[in-house]
Amino acid sequence: EVEKTACPSGKKAREIDESLIFYKKWELEACVDAALLATQMDRVNAIPFTYEQLDVLKHKLDELYPQGYPESVIQHLGYLFLKMSPEDIRKWNVTSLETLKALLEVNKGHEMSPQVATLIDRFVKGRGQLDKDTLDTLTAFYPGYLCSLSPEELSSVPPSSIWAVRPQDLDTCDPRQLDVLYPKARLAFQNMNGSEYFVKIQSFLGGAPTEDLKALSQQNVSMDLATFMKLRTDAVLPLTVAEVQKLLGPHVEGLKAEERHRPVRDWILRQRQDDLDTLGLGLQGGIPNGYLVLDLSMQEALS
């Protein structure tokens, strides 16, 4: 906190320029008019102020706008944005995508900070939903953004926004998130033909139910093992050996290397051994020939 002192004669700032780097903190406090600073915020980035001097400039803006900065100032904060706390940002009303981009640019190349997370939260809540342009922007800066949202938050993503999602944006999503995103992707890509559809839907398949996997197995998609390993175990278990063979195509040979890992391991345990043997991969652990498999869940449902 800089104590209030009168500005020395002749030092009153008429504009925000490089001469201010020679001012001591108390001189900045006393000699820079906050309203002038607010109208010339864009100049601050071009001046190599010290961090301490930037603190003073922030303090002046805080005094001028105790209820939160207007968007005209926010858009030109530049480096000063890094001085803001989440509490400061919660007072803002950011509606322009250009403002959001300008501030994300400041943090570019760094992990998502609490300030950025708060900014995005304020922006998205203000818009009411994650529209395509916003999602485009956020995933461009933070590929993992989508997977940082809760399933509840993801439910506000309209299917049209799914077109903006790239495979790498889903790398860190867990099954609960993919459960929400998959139906949206299915809807978004429904008018595409078989091979194009598979290319687009592939990244979302961790949320696909059994019936959709069965349908895909009829389309010669040749799913790779990496995608197969990310499928929901409960969706894979009911698939027959023939369906898995069709689903994977030439990649079926990769099952051998993954036979100890889920979902392959659990799927093997559910298959008849003689069916597994037809693959010629040496997969072991299936149900021995002559054994009867009782589906107890079915029996409970009947009683």
Epitope: E18, D42, R43, N45, A46, I47, P48, F49, T50, G78, Y79, F81, E105, V106
Partner: nanobody, 117 residues
């Protein structure tokens, strides 16, 4: 991506030193540069400034006529020529780079020590 200062040392009053501020990992061309100094127990203060083009320079009143700032963009370096040094010029000198509108990157060096005694 960093700034590295060099050229500091011990010098007698009235002597000269030339400090260098070299950019590592990025190009200085587009950055305005400021030299600052901090004496023990004192607030860091601005000493000199040069615009990205080199066309505009500015100095603190206490060093005007004695210090000269210049830049060699081909060498990715900014210099501070310090003449007629005084004991009160003693401190750690560091440089800072500011990118300007549309480029909010900002870099600081670790500093180089100057002792006038």
């Amino acid at each position: 991506l960093q700034l590295v200062e060099s050229g500091g040392g011990l010098v007698q009053p009235g002597g000269s030193l030339r400090l260098s501020c070299a950019a590592s990992g990025f190009t200085l061309d587009y950055y305005a540069i400021g030299w600052f100094r901090q004496a023990p127990g004192k607030e860091r203060e601005g000493v000199s400034y040069i615009s990205s083009s080199g066309g505009s320079t500015n100095y603190a009143d206490s060093v005007k006529g004695r210090f000269t700032i210049s830049r060699d963009n081909a060498k990715n370096t900014v210099y501070l020529q310090m003449n007629s040094l005084k004991p009160e010029d003693t401190g750690v000198y560091s440089c800072a780079a500011a990118g300007g509108y549309g480029n909010t990157s900002r870099y600081w060096g670790q500093g180089t020590s100057v002792t006038v005694s």
